[in-house]
């Protein structure tokens, strides 16, 4: 089991202290109150890169 502060959860998931495991961020659309959903919204979107100068 992963402990908080060790290797991060895989992409698209976030650590739940209430469940002691990584949880799929997709479930936050149905149930946004879950504790791990805070971690899902914490990651900033990837920066937009222009393909030309």
């Amino acid at each position: 089991e992963q402990a908080p502060g060790t290797a991060p959860c895989s992409h698209g998931s976030s650590w739940s202290a209430d469940l002691d495991k990584c949880m799929d961020c997709a479930s936050c659309r149905a149930r946004p109150h879950s504790d791990f959903c805070l971690g899902c919204s914490a990651a900033p979107p990837a920066p937009f890169r222009l393909l030309w100068p």
């Epitope: 089991e1 202290a17 209430d18 469940l19 002691d20 149905a30 149930r31 109150h33 879950s34």
Partner: antibody, heavy 120, light 108 residues
């Protein structure tokens, strides 16, 4: 066979303390979230407290916050509820229950309950 | 907090009757609704989870439906052992859960 067995209930005066225990058997205790639920005489079910599998995360109903403490000892397969500053309105049968194995969406096994009576 | 309201509070029925109990949430809880049966002096027993999934070992005469705010527990043909009190429980805000006030099913 999954079993949850509560103990520690009894008669206590207002302002007193009790410690309830819930001994688990028949399953691996450590991966499961657990809760305490109570039922006052002739009344419905009221959620009291939640604890995560490791014991690192706990939550309480407003009615008991600051007075009750939930804990667990995974090496002893036991859940606890320390109840302080007890009031007459805490009189109830207290049940422990096991959360579902993937989430805490539902509670699939319950103990038989232990009666706590707060009276002078 | 999400309030759960069951109706009726009690009902009288005969063996073989079709019985329907409703549970309404004060706001949408998607499908995060469970049903329990409790007999006097006994612990609650899980019947239905996530609105419509039958718990293992529960007879198929029990069924659940609904989503959002309105949910139903149906007993297709009431049996003598079904006389009990039934509770709904929302898990949308888990681990902060709430129960309905209960529906007592009595013998007519």
């Amino acid at each position: 066979e999954v079993q949850l067995l509560e103990s520690g209930g009894g008669l206590v005066q207002p302002g007193g303390s009790l410690r309830l225990s819930c001994a688990a058997s028949g399953f691996t205790f450590s991966p499961y979230p657990m809760i305490w639920v109570r039922q006052a005489p002739g009344k419905g079910l009221e959620w009291v407290s939640y604890i995560s599998p490791s014991g690192g995360s706990t939550h309480y109903a407003d009615s008991v916050k600051g007075r009750f403490t939930i804990s667990r000892d995974n090496s002893k397969n036991t859940l606890y509820l320390q109840m302080n500053s007890l009031r007459a309105e805490d009189t109830a049968v207290y049940y422990c229950a096991r959360g579902g194995d993937t989430y805490f969406d539902y509670f699939d096994y319950w103990g038989q309950g232990t009666l706590v009576t707060v009276s002078s | 907090d999400i309030q759960m309201t069951q109706s009726p509070s009690s009902l009288s029925a005969s063996v073989g009757d079709r019985v329907t109990i409703t549970c309404r949430a004060s706001q949408s809880i998607s499908g995060y609704l469970n049903w329990y049966q409790q007999k006097p002096g006994k612990a609650p027993k899980l019947l239905i989870y996530q609105a419509s999934s039958l718990q293992s070992g529960v007879p198929s005469r029990f069924s659940g439906s609904g989503s959002g705010t309105d949910f139903t527990l149906t007993i297709s043909s009431l049996q003598p052992e079904d006389f009990a009190t039934y509770y709904c429980q929302q898990s949308y805000t888990s681990p902060f859960i709430t129960f309905g006030q209960g529906t007592k099913v009595e013998i007519k």
